[in-house]
């Protein structure tokens, strides 16, 4: 028998990825980071 239509049995949690760059003053370049769910990971 074919299966009746149902959604997947698990919930997908979407997280916002935020790229940012912070100027730390002249001659010192910049800090580039990746924030995932509020935590800086890079």
């Amino acid at each position: 028998d074919a299966e009746f239509r149902h959604d997947s049995g698990y919930e997908v949690h979407h997280q916002k990825l935020v790229f940012f760059a912070e100027d730390v003053g002249s001659n010192k370049g910049a800090i580039i980071g990746l924030m995932v769910g509020g935590v800086v990971i890079a």
Epitope: D1, H6, G9
Partner: antibody
Framework: QVTLKESGPALVKPTQTLTLTCTLS??????????VGWIRQPPGKALEWLAH???????SYNPSLKSRLTISKDTSKNQVVLTMTNMDPVDTATYYC???????????????WGQGTTVTVSS | DVVMTQSPLSLPVTPGEPASISCRSS???????????LEWYLQKPGQSPQLLIY???NRFSGVPDRFSGSGSGTDFTLKISRVEAEDVGVYYC?????????FGQGTKLEIK
Amino acid sequence: QVTLKESGPALVKPTQTLTLTCTLSGFSLSTSGMGVGWIRQPPGKALEWLAHIWWDDDKSYNPSLKSRLTISKDTSKNQVVLTMTNMDPVDTATYYCARRQLGLRSIDAMDYWGQGTTVTVSS
Amino acid sequence: DVVMTQSPLSLPVTPGEPASISCRSSQSILHSNGNTYLEWYLQKPGQSPQLLIYKVSNRFSGVPDRFSGSGSGTDFTLKISRVEAEDVGVYYCLQTTRVPLTFGQGTKLEIK
């Protein structure tokens, strides 16, 4: 509040085509995940599932009756229509429509039913 | 088709006493998504069916907690911890994992 109401002829003759309408209120069939199905119950007997239609026009039929059934929807009228061809006295039953909604935050069960409409097939 | 077999077909119960209804499927009704779509409905006299339990053990909103569902694979049970007069009617199990959706033949609960 959510309601479903079935309408159609109370009496049809053998070999004729039955057309039943389910009018929905309190929710929209155009809502993602929404679906409406038809179930029937012969006098004194158990329930039998007939067909189901989804918001995206996907349809599912009981294979034993598929050749006789057509389910469709009119989103503008918020109605679902079931037609059954070549009616026979054994098709005498109360016909119900019921709501079912897909989704991880939905019940995904027949949570609201109409009051049913009784159809007698006789010459 | 998946055949749903209920027992007993008739269930006389004294108010305040527990009641149990069995529903067995002819094959597994575990969906490929990991859920088991087994539902219980009550049809009170002269009324449309009403949802009690979905996905084996989840009580629908407004359903008293004296109703509980359990089971897995092919063997399922609806239990009423203390039967009340308003619980009379016909109880149906329904599997919605496979097409066609199939109901049990019904269990008529009556008050002794």
